[in-house]
């Protein structure tokens, strides 16, 4: 049986829209699936790498590395997503190409990043981890660090950086799917929402769905243990 | 072609309050954002403020806040712009002009406002 | 808020001559300036959005550089029409800011 949950939601375009949480219902009148999972129950994603789901990872990552940030041109705020969902004429979709893009390295000007931009985070103004040295980032969006430390300036001169940041990561089902949503539509969908990320590519979904004891490499699922504590 | 038809002048007594009226044509209303600016006589030009036709999200210049109040009717495409508690200060000539690309790159022909009692 | 200075605030310049008008922002804004041509009891008119990018239909004898907070405004050989008022316009934050305005008056 499914439980069905409507509600008028705040999405990323800032608009509420009416959106609908289907949950599977227990059978035997008990938990949810998800809360069965955290409990130790026998699901094969958590023991093992599940095909499907890695092809899923792998699909939502390709897509992200070809998103920028849209800023919405009413001051609304901004929020990570492809072009095709950025309006042309309401918002600005920062997205570096060409030579619009900052150097790679502040002391080699000749190499332009074509990967961002991404809203609140930029190698120019995190300052942890620092993007210099050997420890350059990558010109792929999908490789870059949780920035934990901000360069302390309230304007940057970036557009994507001074925006009113709308949407952030948000792990979706038992599948470990990930979206770039507002906070209340990922607490109405029983998501987990990641405060402290800018990308689906920085957290680790399945991770956090299966629970338990935390995977030694946050890609490969490791919890064999399962067999025995169902 | 694009239009922004704006509502004729206005003498008005202090105290009171005025609405100003700006018609689209030529183009899809909710697809722009519309801006209001301030223009005194003889002096420069002041931001008002934005409205978002499409899901009604207005931002205001904070010196503007209490003073203008904007909203748009999708079925008539048109934007309008309320001024209350008007005094002398308020006398201006006011602009509604269509965003794009953050700049304004089409303007009504401006409504005057004249507040004297 | 971000305030913009232009100057100057006017300038006698004769047919066929060139002109610069400058805008400093108080604070960086990128390339995010827009340049308009007022006439006498007129509406602005766009010239110049995202600070070099001539708007639709505008002569290209109107130009624009610079980013930061250091722009510049530039009509080289000017024609009886362009002696008008100009205005700068930071459109990177709100509330968007205009510069004071430069009037070109004819030598």
């Known amino acids: 049986a499914q439980h069905v949950t409507t509600q008028l939601v705040l999405r990323n375009k800032g608009v509420y829209e009416s959106v609908k949480y289907i949950q599977q219902e227990n059978f035997w009148i008990g938990p949810s699936s998800i809360d069965l999972i955290h409990l130790g129950a026998k699901f094969s994603p958590c023991i093992r790498k599940d095909q499907q789901i890695e092809q899923l990872v792998l699909r939502e990552r390709d897509l992200e590395r070809d998103s920028g940030c849209c800023v919405q041109n009413d001051h609304s705020g901004c929020i990570q997503t492809q072009r095709k969902d950025c309006s042309e004429t309401l918002a600005t979709f920062v997205k570096w190409q060409d030579d619009t893009g900052p150097p790679m390295d502040k002391s080699d000007l000749g190499q332009k990043r074509t990967s961002g931009a991404v809203c609140h985070q930029d190698p120019r103004t995190c300052e942890e981890p620092a993007s210099s040295g050997a420890h350059i980032w990558p010109d792929d969006i999908t490789k870059w660090p949780i920035c934990t430390e901000q360069a302390k300036s309230n304007r940057t001169g970036f557009l994507h950086m001074d925006c009113q940041i709308k949407g952030r990561p948000c792990c979706i089902s038992t599948k470990g799917s990930c979206e770039i949503t507002t906070r209340e539509y990922c607490e109405f969908m029983h998501g987990y929402f990641h405060e402290e990320a800018t990308l689906c590519s920085q957290v680790h979904c399945l991770d956090k769905v299966c629970g338990l004891l935390p995977f030694l490499n946050p890609e490969v699922p490791d919890q064999f243990y399962r067999l025995w504590l169902s | 072609q694009v239009q922004l038809q704006q509502s004729g002048a206005e003498l008005v007594r202090p105290g009171t309050s005025v609405k100003v009226s700006c018609k689209a044509s030529?183009?899809?209303?909710?697809?722009?954002?519309i801006e209001w600016v301030k223009q005194r006589p003889g002096q420069g030009l002041e931001w008002i403020g934005v409205i978002n036709p499409g899901s009604g999200f207005t931002n205001y210049n904070e010196k503007f806040k209490g003073k203008a109040i904007l909203n748009a009717d999708k079925s008539s495409s048109t934007a309008y712009m309320q001024l209350i508690s008007l005094t002398s200060e308020d006398s201006a000539v006011y602009f509604c002009?269509?965003?794009?690309?953050?700049?304004?790159?089409?303007w009504g022909q401006g409504t005057s406002v004249t507040v004297s009692s | 808020d971000i305030q913009m200075t232009q100057s100057p605030a006017s300038q006698s310049a004769s047919l066929g001559e060139s002109v610069t008008i400058t805008c400093l922002a108080s604070q960086t804004i990128g390339t995010w300036l827009a340049w308009y041509q007022q006439k006498p009891g007129k509406s602005p008119q766009l010239l110049i959005h995202?600070?070099?990018s001539l708007a639709d239909g505008v002569p290209s004898r109107f130009s624009g550089s610079g980013s930061g907070t250091k722009f510049s405004f530039k009509i080289s050989s000017l024609q009886a029409e362009d002696f008008v008022s100009y205005y700068c316009?930071?459109?990177?934050?709100?509330?968007?800011?205009f510069g004071g305005g430069t009037k070109l008056e004819i030598k």
């Open positions: 995202a600070a070099t």
């Open positions: 030529g183009y899809a209303f909710t697809n722009y954002l």
């Open positions: 316009q930071q459109i990177y934050s709100s509330p968007y800011t």
């Open positions: 002009a269509r965003d794009l690309k953050r700049a304004m790159d089409h």
